[in-house]
Each structure stands twice: as C-alpha cells, then as structure tokens.
C-alpha cells in the first residue's frame, strides 16, 4: 500500500494564496463597514455596545510587528468562527427589526464562511499545524428584547470591522516576510 502520506504539500507560491486571502478579507471589511453604516442609520446607536461572548480584539496595530504567521492565522480563524456564529445567531434570533438588514446580513455570513474556508486552505498550503477541532460552543442566549438584538448587532458588526481591519494589516505585514 505505497509510501505513508507525507506532510501537506506546500503551494509553489504561498504569497499568491496569501494575496487571495487578503482580497477576501478586504472585501469583507468593506462589506462590514457599509452594513454597519446601514445599521447606524436604521437604528442609531446610543454609545458603544459590547457583547461578552464576542472575542477580544486580537492585537493592537502597534503590536503587529511581533506577529508570526501560524499564530496570526490560528487566532484570526478562531475569532472569525466566533463572529460567524454570532452573525448566524443574529439572523436567527435578532428579531423582526433586523430583517431589514437582509439580504446584506446573509451575504455577509456567506462571505465570512468563504473567508474561513480560505484561511483553512491557506494554513494547509503553508503546511502549518492544523488547530484542533473546535470545542462545541455554549449556545448564545436569545436577546432579551428587540432593542437587545439591535444592540447586539451594533456590537457584532463593530467588533467584526475592527477584527478584519487588524487582519488586513497583519496579513499584509506577514506577506512581506514570506
């Protein structure tokens, strides 16, 4: 039965894979900016909103210099998985008010899912150690009110925007080190 399988084959040009990931991330960043603006117009935010279940921002811009590729991709994937879960929850449990953000919210979810698959592919192409399977996350409690759903939407889109902005900067910096 042939030789044992070797390590994952590294793509001839991992920079091209990284470029593709940067493009997807940047596109999703613009989508998120535009959708957050739409949300603010429909439901103006009274100050900043937080959601305890959201990931904390991975890194300040100033600390980007110390980043290493495996750590960035693993952390980014974990954070984006959390945001995907939150967007799915928002669409399911956010209430009738947030239906006015469809189909954009659905498009955002699909593109977030696509970016996650791209990150997974990039990690395998770069022969990076694959993260262990994600432990089942505790279910998110439904918002206590319609306004609770709107506040959650502000927090989710705001946090996702910051995460993606950090991701674009980080990925571009890492590209220069490949």
């Amino acid at each position: 039965p042939g030789p044992p399988p070797g390590p994952p084959r590294v793509s001839p040009d991992p920079r091209a894979e990284l470029d593709s990931t940067v493009l997807l991330t940047r596109s999703l960043l613009a989508d998120t900016r535009q959708l957050a603006a739409q949300l603010r117009d429909k439901f103006p935010a009274d100050g900043d909103h937080n959601l305890d279940s959201l990931p904390t921002l991975a890194m300040s811009a100033g600390a980007l210099g110390a980043l290493q590729l495996p750590g960035v991709l693993t952390r980014l994937r974990a954070d984006l998985l959390s945001y995907l879960r939150h967007v799915q929850w928002l669409r399911r449990a956010g209430g009738s008010s947030l239906k006015t953000l469809e189909p954009e919210l659905g498009t955002l979810q699909a593109r977030l899912d696509r970016l996650l698959r791209r990150l997974q592919l990039l990690m395998s192409r770069l022969a990076l150690p694959q993260p262990p399977p994600d432990p089942p996350a505790p279910p998110l409690a439904p918002p206590s009110s319609a306004w609770g759903g709107i506040r959650a939407a502000h927090a989710i889109l705001g946090g996702l925007h910051l995460t993606l902005d950090w991701a674009v900067r980080g990925l571009l910096l890492l590209k220069t080190r490949l």
């Epitope: 493009l23 940047r26 596109s27 535009q34 603006a37 117009d41 103006p44 571009l172």
Partner: antibody, heavy 120, light 108 residues
C-alpha cells in the same frame, strides 16, 4: 433624471468660512449616501467627505478633518458642506456626487461644481 | 491610505487607434472596488466603468476595463474624437477613498 446642482462658492479670505449647498432632484434623496469631491485648478480629483442616507455615519479626508462639516436635510433634498478655517490649498471646484446604490459609497452621479477661491 | 498611480501621465494618439491606460494600486484591492471616470475640460467627471469591468449607463462598448489585485487597465478599442479627455481610476474599498492622478488622452 438625476440632477445635482451645487451653489455657495465664491471668494473668501484665508481663515474665513463658506457654506456650500447641493440641491438634488430626480431620485429619492433620503435613500442615498452623498459625497463632496474637489478639484484644485489644473489638478486631479480629491475626495473630501461622505455622509450616509440617515447622516449617522460620516467620513472625512484627513486634509479637511476638524475644519469641514458635511450634513444633509432629507426633507429639503439638500446636501451641505460647512467649510471653516479655509486655507489657500482649499481653492478648488467642489462637486457633490451621489452613490450608485444605497451604502455602496460610489460616485455614480456628479453635479457641475462650484468654485471656491481662498485668497487675500 | 491606498495610493493609485496612473500611467502614462499623457497619452497622444489618433482617432481610430487603440488606447490602453493603466492604474497601479499600492495595496491589493478586490476588483469590485475599482472604478474609472472620464472628465472633459470644463465639465464634471462622469462614471465610465464600475467594479473594474462594468460599463456605466450610456457608455459605448468601445470602452472596457480589466485587471485584478494591484494592476487595472482601461481600454478604448478605437478612439473617437469625443474620447479625448482625462481619465481617473478610483478605489472604494478603503476610507479615505482615493483617485489616481489622471491620464490625459490627447489627439496626436
């Protein structure tokens, strides 16, 4: 037919103020984000500011931040640009522009522009 | 800030010739956020091509756009007298929104 007509330009001294207006017609003004873009004499285009349909998100170019204020009155189908602390380098033709579709932030339709001259 | 660099600064051609204008972007940008405008002397700019390759309403089919990543191109297959103007590329993926410095297409 989409129409955008700018007004309010003129000659102003350095440090002075001016308020530009843009009257919109031919579309549902309250559904579209709007921009101001400027062009110095003989130079290229420079984006100045953007405002969403409901005025709750506003972006400015660094060159005008803190000095210019974009605003709109959806009931009057009007866009405004309040320009304070004017400098010689603000001399330009100022255009208002409408985005292509809601929240896409594009520059699909343009007015004919109004000239602002900052000089002593 | 994303910087767009257009080349050449001036292009001298005759009617009937093919024109190729380039726009080089300092960072990778998705193709749906790159647009082209035409401006004639004393007139406002007008949208020519949006999302890299889509013709705006009323724009003749001799205009076309292509490109990806950091390199984008506007092509005019056979120049008509009314095509001599200044052309600008623009990115809308990132704030601040930025324009290239323009390419002046002049009659040879």
């Amino acid at each position: 037919e989409v129409q955008l007509v700018e007004s309010g330009g003129g000659l102003v001294q350095p440090g002075g103020s001016l308020r530009l207006s843009c009257a919109a017609s031919g579309f549902t003004f309250s559904s579209f984000g709007m921009h101001w873009v400027r062009q110095a004499p003989g130079k290229g285009l420079e984006w100045v500011a953007y405002i969403t349909p409901g005025s709750n998100t506003i972006y400015y170019a660094d060159t005008v931040k803190g000095r210019f204020t974009i605003s709109r009155d959806n009931a009057k189908n009007s866009l405004y640009l309040q320009m304070n602390s004017l400098r010689a380098e603000d001399t330009a033709v100022y255009y208002c522009a409408r985005e292509y579709s809601s929240y896409d932030e594009g520059f699909a339709y343009w007015g004919q522009g109004t000239l602002v001259t900052v000089s002593s | 800030e994303i910087v767009l660099t257009q080349s050449p600064a001036t292009l001298s051609l005759s009617p009937g010739e093919r024109a190729t204008l380039s726009c080089s972007v300092s960072d990778l940008i998705p193709s749906q956020y790159l647009h082209w405008y035409q401006q004639k002397p004393g007139q406002a700019p007008r949208l020519l091509i949006y999302r890299t390759s889509n013709l705006a309403s009323g724009i003749p089919a001799r205009f076309s756009g292509s490109g990806s990543g950091t390199d984008f191109t506007l092509t005019i297959s056979s120049l008509e007298p009314e095509d001599f103007a200044v052309y600008y590329c623009q990115q809308g993926v990132d704030v601040p929104f930025t324009f290239g410095q323009g390419t002046k297409l002049e009659i040879k």
